[in-house]
Interface confidence: low
Amino acid sequence: SSSPTSSASSFSSSAPFLASAVSAQPPLPDQCPALCECSEAARTVKCVNRNLTEVPTDLPAYVRNLFLTGNQLAVLPAGAFARRPPLAELAALNLSGSRLDEVRAGAFEHLPSLRQLDLSHNPLADLSPFAFSGSNASVSAPSPLVELILNHIVPPEDERQNRSFEGMVVAALLAGRALQGLRRLELASNHFLYLPRDVLAQLPSLRHLDLSNNSLVSLTYVSFRNLTHLESLHLEDNALKVLHNGTLAELQGLPHIRVFLDNNPWVCDCHMADMVTWLKETEVVQGKDRLTCAYPEKMRNRVLLELNSADLDCDPILPPSLQTS
């Protein structure tokens, strides 16, 4: 995943926490929160694996890259990063692995330069629809986010709300059309069974979409047509059985696309013929020579590119009277 990188050197350790009722005075330029390491030269603050239960209030105004990984934040409330003056330089925020289970509306408000956000490896049982838009207006002010990393944010089964996890995530992505400028979206390892049909059409700036290691069975109702800037589409390690003509044509029509399809349980029967023909002709699929059949049993491990139409048959459906158990 694309975490904020840092060439941090000369980290300084910190003074004790300020009281939570923050003074109106701006923080001292060399101040560093307790349990954090700071490098003004690298514009980086690292509060990593310190079991913090809330975001430090006294973050230095210069911070551009903030790592709050490996903590125990649990809840990210509205205005969690709101400061006076705002943390106007903060561009990359990594909150991965911090045991967040709830991200509330407006959690990232007052971060006018936030371009990269990583919430991976948090069991997000409750992601507010307005977590990223910060407003419940039908059209919000545009978010500055360019990269949103949401790998492995699915909570354990027993902690999920009584609603579709896919729907909850998509609602946050689409609220207020705030993420129109998003270029990278990573949603790997989230047990997604389907992709709601409207999600991609409303993220027209996407260059990179990672849906690997989910449980997607079909892309029949997903349209890639509007994603004219899409450069990489990761669909490895899903449950895809076949890609149908409409999807193939849409992918072929994207001018810069590279598609990754490894480790899907391809079903090599008569419905696979169009996809095999397409694979033989297309340049967009990376590692296409590695794609192999999983079903039916007689076709297991056959390389898709080596199949011909005679190999791809469907067993005739017998009338009920002739079927055997």
Epitope: T57, A78, G79, A82, R83, G106, E109, P112, G134
Partner: antibody, heavy 117, light 108 residues
Framework: EVQLVESGGGLVQPGGSLRLSCAAS????????ISWVRQAPGKGLEWVAE????????YYNEKFKGRFTISRDNAKNSLYLQMNSLRAEDTAVYYC??????????WGQGTLVTVSS | DIQMTQSPSSLSASVGDRVTITCTAS???????LHWYQQKPGKAPKLLIY???NLASGVPSRFSGSGSGTDFTLTISSLQPEDFATYYC?????????FGGGTKVEIK
Amino acid sequence: EVQLVESGGGLVQPGGSLRLSCAASGYTFTDYVISWVRQAPGKGLEWVAEIYPGSNSIYYNEKFKGRFTISRDNAKNSLYLQMNSLRAEDTAVYYCARGGNYGFDYWGQGTLVTVSS
Amino acid sequence: DIQMTQSPSSLSASVGDRVTITCTASSSVNSNYLHWYQQKPGKAPKLLIYSTSNLASGVPSRFSGSGSGTDFTLTISSLQPEDFATYYCHQYHRSPLTFGGGTKVEIK
């Protein structure tokens, strides 16, 4: 429908205290910053303090720090302003206002505080 | 503190006039955090324009905002009877949050 309703205003003598309340409804209280703003008769708007109901962040106008205390009760969806050592110049209409990146989008109707002997 | 200075402090205009109100900040304000409000006598202020140039919900398109840094402008392209009110600019950037002194728009 979002509603903010202030109460607790009235006549108080100089040096006295008053506690204003703001009852919020129609939205998730812990999702928005909320402020107190006051307006003296015939004058402009003056920001007093703000609080992020979902966290512990509080900001004061230094002018009021020490005399005024902002607080909230999330269970009651309520915001408070405790005002001590009141002076004649604190006479004003006090508004609570819901905020966010996009300004104060909802205001209460205001409650009048009169400090006079 | 960031001082917000509005000019003029009052103006008289007729229905249909184009009206411009300026707001000057004593130091630079991030344009995301510069807002305008309208207030009528005896009423609470109402958000008019947020983040320098975005119309708040339900605000007519004759209102517009512009500016950056320290200089911001509110324009009413064609004044209507219901627009006679006091207008305030507001910086939501640096504590203490501050408002301009107000511009009262009166009927000529």
